[in-house]
């Protein structure tokens, strides 16, 4: 006959490990007892349990309550045991010794491997601002046994660097993602992906990128100067810019205070029916926590009567 076992038994931390040991004997052979021991190199054998065909299971005090026989029905040639709630300290070599009649004794070894799944964490880097050089966007750390794999999933262009720290029974892996911040990255996801044999599926942590920027400011509304004439209603100037964080807008007049009746509504400056009083230089001031921008325009309110008079003069001059 011969013993059937596994070379390596792999179990996730906290789960139960089956330590297999099955005697494949010839017809009529019987198993008298099975002794299980831990036999790590350089250390003496430590008894786990003894399975006796007549007297049942005896578990050594060190493993009391943690070692069981399989539930019935049990094949009398099956010397497997169950190690409940595996911990990292259980990782190592185990041996089963089977006493059979009439064939004698057999022994087999297996290695128990306890996987410790990682609990990854993602830490965003310093605030990202447009114009910076290569900057840390985020770092992701995962510790487990064996060492986990840490990668990044993103559409954003960047570079990664990884480092590993080995501990006595595990390894911590940290991966950093660096990029050159640009406004196009705003709102883009940056996902840390952690793979490990103890995980049923990859663990993913997503960080949304925020890049501070402020676009150049411009003013819309003066495209057709001829519309800016005395008496016109609904005239307005709109300040155009964009930024992250969203900017605030402020309107001033360079050559004096804003005329009475002019309404400031965020990025928009609304005028009452136009008079020559509204002529002047207007400044839109755009700012956020990152930067500030100005844009100025000159409003020249036309007097239609003056214009027509001028035209007549010109005609008569010709």
């Amino acid at each position: 006959g011969e013993l059937e076992t596994s070379d390596v038994v792999t179990v996730v931390l906290g789960q139960d490990a089956k330590l297999p040991c099955f005697y494949r004997g010839d017809s009529g052979e019987q198993v008298g007892q099975v002794a299980w021991a831990r036999v790590d190199a350089g250390e003496g054998a430590q008894e786990l349990a003894l399975l006796h065909s007549k007297y049942g299971l005896h578990v050594s005090p060190a493993y009391e309550g943690r070692v069981e026989q399989p539930p019935p029905p049990r094949n009398p040639l099956d010397g497997s045991v169950l190690l409940r709630n595996a911990v990292q300290a259980d990782e190592g070599e185990y041996e089963c010794r089977v006493s059979t009649f009439p064939a004698g004794s057999f022994q087999a070894r297996l290695r128990l491997r306890v996987l410790v799944p990682p609990l990854p964490s993602l830490n965003p880097g310093p605030a990202l601002e447009e114009g910076q050089g290569l900057t840390l966007a985020a770092s992701c750390t995962a510790e487990g046994s064996p060492a986990p794999s840490v990668t990044w999933d993103t559409e954003v262009k960047g570079t990664t660097s990884s480092r590993s720290f080995k501990h006595s029974r595990s390894a911590a892996v940290t991966s950093e993602f660096h990029l050159v911040p640009s406004r196009s990255m705003n709102g883009q996801p940056l996902t840390c992906v952690v793979s490990h044999p103890g995980l049923l599926q990859d663990q993913r942590i997503t960080h949304i990128l925020h890049v501070s920027f402020l676009a150049e400011a411009s003013v819309r509304g003066l495209e057709d100067q001829n519309l800016w004439h005395i008496g016109r209603e609904g005239a307005m100037l709109k300040c155009l810019s964009e930024g992250q964080p969203p900017p605030s807008y402020n309107w001033t007049r360079l050559d004096g205070p804003l005329p009475s009746g002019v309404r400031v509504d965020g990025d928009t400056l609304g005028f009452p029916p136009l008079t020559t009083e509204h002529s002047g230089i207007y400044v839109c001031h755009v700012s956020n926590e990152f930067s500030s921008r100005d844009s100025q325009v000159t409003v020249d309110v036309l007097d239609p009567q003056e214009d027509s008079g001028k035209q007549v003069d010109l005609v008569s001059a010709s």
């Epitope: 019935p72 029905p73 094949n75 040639l77």
Partner: antibody, heavy 123, light 107 residues
Framework: QVQLQQPGAELVMPGASVKMSCKAS????????MHWVKQRPGQGLEWIGA????????SYNQKFKGKATLTVDESSSTAYMQLSSLTSEDSAVYYC?????????WGYGMDNWGQGTSVTVSS | DIQMTQTTSSLSASLGDRVTISCRAS??????LNWYQQKPDGTVKLLIY???RLHSGVPSRFSGSGSGTDYSLTISNLEQEDIATYFC?????????FGGGTKLEIK
């Protein structure tokens, strides 16, 4: 995927015997035990016994010893149950069910069941 | 033999309800308690093994708990497809024995 195929029905005479089959596919037959369960019309489930398909070791419910005989044919991945000296009490649906006691797994529940064979004992 | 008792033979509930089915063993069964679902067409499936472990492919609305002699199966959010008979089974001592079953119906 794992499948256990059983014939739908068997009609047998009182006093006779019947041998029903359970053909396994989708897994390594000899890695798992095969259990047999009886269900009388409108009744609960009753465990008959089980066979270790790797070496034909059997374990029976005392109540069915002498009534049921469990065997396997490794070459066709088929488990069999023979019922002898049939009476009306043996009229029931008989299920075969796989039990996950393998080299690496622990046998807990019967994780795959056949559709059942309905046995009617009648003259 | 260990007797398994499911005191409620039939149970009526509404869709979306939380339903609990209990099972009692005549002696300690060391958590070797499994739950099976039998559909009206006779199909049998394993739901829960070793008291509380969800069999692969079984919806997470099914859960099991208990210890010693008292065990229960809970369906947290009853769906139409859960209409079936539920059996408990002990695997601690031979012969294996089953509860009488609890038939679940829709109100």
């Amino acid at each position: 995927q794992v499948q256990l195929q059983q014939p739908g029905a068997e009609l047998v005479m009182p006093g006779a015997s019947v041998k029903m089959s359970c053909k396994a596919s989708g897994y390594t037959f000899t890695d798992y035990w095969m259990h047999w369960v009886k269900q009388r019309p409108g009744q609960g489930l009753e465990w008959i016994g089980a066979i270790d398909t790797s070496d034909s070791y059997t374990s029976y419910n005392q109540k069915f010893k002498g009534k049921a005989t469990l065997t396997v044919d490794e070459s066709s991945s088929t488990a069999y149950m023979q019922l002898s000296s049939l009476t009306s009490e043996d009229s029931a649906v008989y299920y075969c069910a796989r039990w996950g006691s393998t080299m690496i797994t622990w046998g807990y529940g019967m994780d795959n069941w056949g559709q059942g064979t309905s046995v009617t004992v009648s003259s | 033999d260990i007797q398994m008792t499911q005191t409620t033979s039939s149970l009526s509930a509404s869709l979306g309800d939380r339903v609990t089915i209990s099972c009692r063993a005549s002696q300690d069964i060391n958590n070797y308690l499994n739950w099976y679902q039998q559909k009206p067409d006779g199909t049998v499936k394993l739901l829960i093994y070793y008291t509380s472990r969800l069999h692969s492919g079984v919806p997470s609305r099914f859960s099991g708990s208990g210890s010693g002699t008292d065990y229960s199966l809970t369906i947290s959010n009853l769906e139409q497809e859960d209409i079936a008979t539920y059996f408990c089974q002990q695997g601690n001592t031979l012969p294996w024995t089953f509860g009488g079953g609890t038939k679940l119906e829709i109100k």
